[in-house]
Interface confidence: low
Amino acid sequence: VPRWRQQWSGPGTTKRFPETVLARCVKYTEIHPEMRHVDCQSVWDAFKGAFISKHPCNITEEDYQPLMKLGTQTVPCNKILLWSRIKDLAHQFTQVQRDMFTLEDTLLGYLADDLTWCGEFNTSKINYQSCPDWRKDCSNNPVSVFWKTVSRRFAEAACDVVHVMLNGSRSKIFDKNSTFGSVEVHNLQPEKVQTLEAWVIHGGREDSRDLCQDPTIKELESIISKRNIQFSCKNIYRPDKFLQCVKNPEDSSCTSEI
């Protein structure tokens, strides 16, 4: 008789999740000399310990503390790029602009990027069939709590000018319910962060509107200003050209507005 298993609304744990996490850890620590001391076995043990045998709707930030401790990493606090709903371009940017970092350029972000995971209460099994959906099932699920934890720590570490890339093609360019809007914005430290600079990425080639005047951007400006952090905003009308100019800043066509 097959054992009864909780059916959740979201997709199950990513296939070969343990191996993927460990392979990524080994790869990351090989590529980043400053993280060579990290023992990937310990990292996996801590990652697993955060959710295995625990109810997948009852995960806390505390569960992830051993993993956070092992993954402690110093990135230049004035070179942080946050993003919301435009991950691919943000990652393309930091691949070119190597001195800037998204969360996924850190060890912990790199380990978990695009993965799903959850366990089951009182068993050591990983649930490959289904995992809780943030909206339909519960918010305190292993994946959501992980990203909330690492995002909070990433934002807390930021200083000077912090950049955020926002998707100008979405109805809510700034979404208070996104990780950026609900976690990162509120964890920037006013005593360390001078300015939050938003880069609004345009989607249409002919779109010449000033999306920095969008009501949601004004809402972001208000939230940031109330936290005693300055706010600035730039339109990136041509993201393709923007990336090209980051690669080749001397190009004559890059001196004009992008």
Epitope: P18, E19, L22, A23, C25, V26, D39, C40, Q41, S42, W44, D45, S124
Partner: antibody, heavy 123, light 110 residues
């Protein structure tokens, strides 16, 4: 509870072959790298070979390269050591040991051991 | 000849503190973690210390590990008669792409 049970040892003539097995239970076998470690009578421990979680990586001590083959069947939760061209100096208790989840060299240690199986090579 | 060097024997009286050394090179202890195992007579080895100084659950805090450069040490405080056993250090050797053990130290409780 993690359990490792070795079998397949015995008396064999020089030049002969044996296949050792290690049946694993109490953990997700295909999450872990596995090793064979041997101990000659009255001597110390000697690492023999290890294999990664999926069998994709294998390593051997120089003295058994080309002679021993480590393998695993994750569907059967079993580790194997095929030993050919056996010599008197291969006489030892052979232990199966659970290593790390991914063959991460810097953290490689043996958290669990079987009770061992004795291989005697003698004419 | 073992890659890691341990004294063949050590001894102490009950209640004493005993230290067992393990010497290696940059390609093993210098670059990688050290583990320690206890082997009671007629039994399989048991993990005592891993990652230089970590104790698995169930191992008394009388056992402690440390490492400096290319050498490691296992300390046993409050020595007991049941500690009489063989003790082995182990590390990974990057140049050999495999694990290496010390020759073992026979601990006698007098």
């Amino acid at each position: 509870e993690v359990q490792l049970l070795e079998s397949g040892g015995g008396l064999v003539q020089p030049g002969g072959s044996l296949r050792l097995s290690c049946a694993a239970s109490g953990f997700t076998f295909d999450d872990y790298g596995m090793s064979w470690v041997r101990q000659a009578p009255g001597k110390g421990l000697e690492w023999v070979s290890d294999i990664s979680w999926n069998g994709g990586k294998t390593h051997y001590v120089d003295s058994v390269k080309g002679q021993f083959t480590i393998s695993r069947d994750n569907s059967k939760n079993t580790l194997y050591l095929q030993m050919n061209s056996l010599r008197a100096e291969d006489t030892a208790v052979y232990y199966c040991a659970r290593g790390s989840l991914f063959h991460d060299s810097s953290g490689f240690y043996f958290g669990h051991w079987g009770q061992g199986t004795l291989v005697t090579v003698s004419s | 000849q073992s890659v890691l060097t341990q004294p063949p024997s050590a001894s102490g009286t009950p209640g004493q503190r005993v230290t067992i050394s393990c010497s290696g090179s940059s390609s093993n202890i210098g670059d990688n973690y050290v583990s320690w195992y206890q082997q009671l007579p007629g039994t399989a080895p048991k993990l005592l210390i891993y990652r230089d100084s970590q104790r698995p659950s169930g191992v008394p805090d009388r056992f402690s590990g440390s490492k400096s450069g290319t050498s490691a040490s296992l300390a046993i405080s409050g020595l007991r008669s049941e500690d009489e056993a063989d003790y082995y250090c182990q590390s990974y050797d990057s140049s050999l792409s495999g694990s290496v053990f010390g020759g073992g130290t026979k601990l006698t409780v007098l």
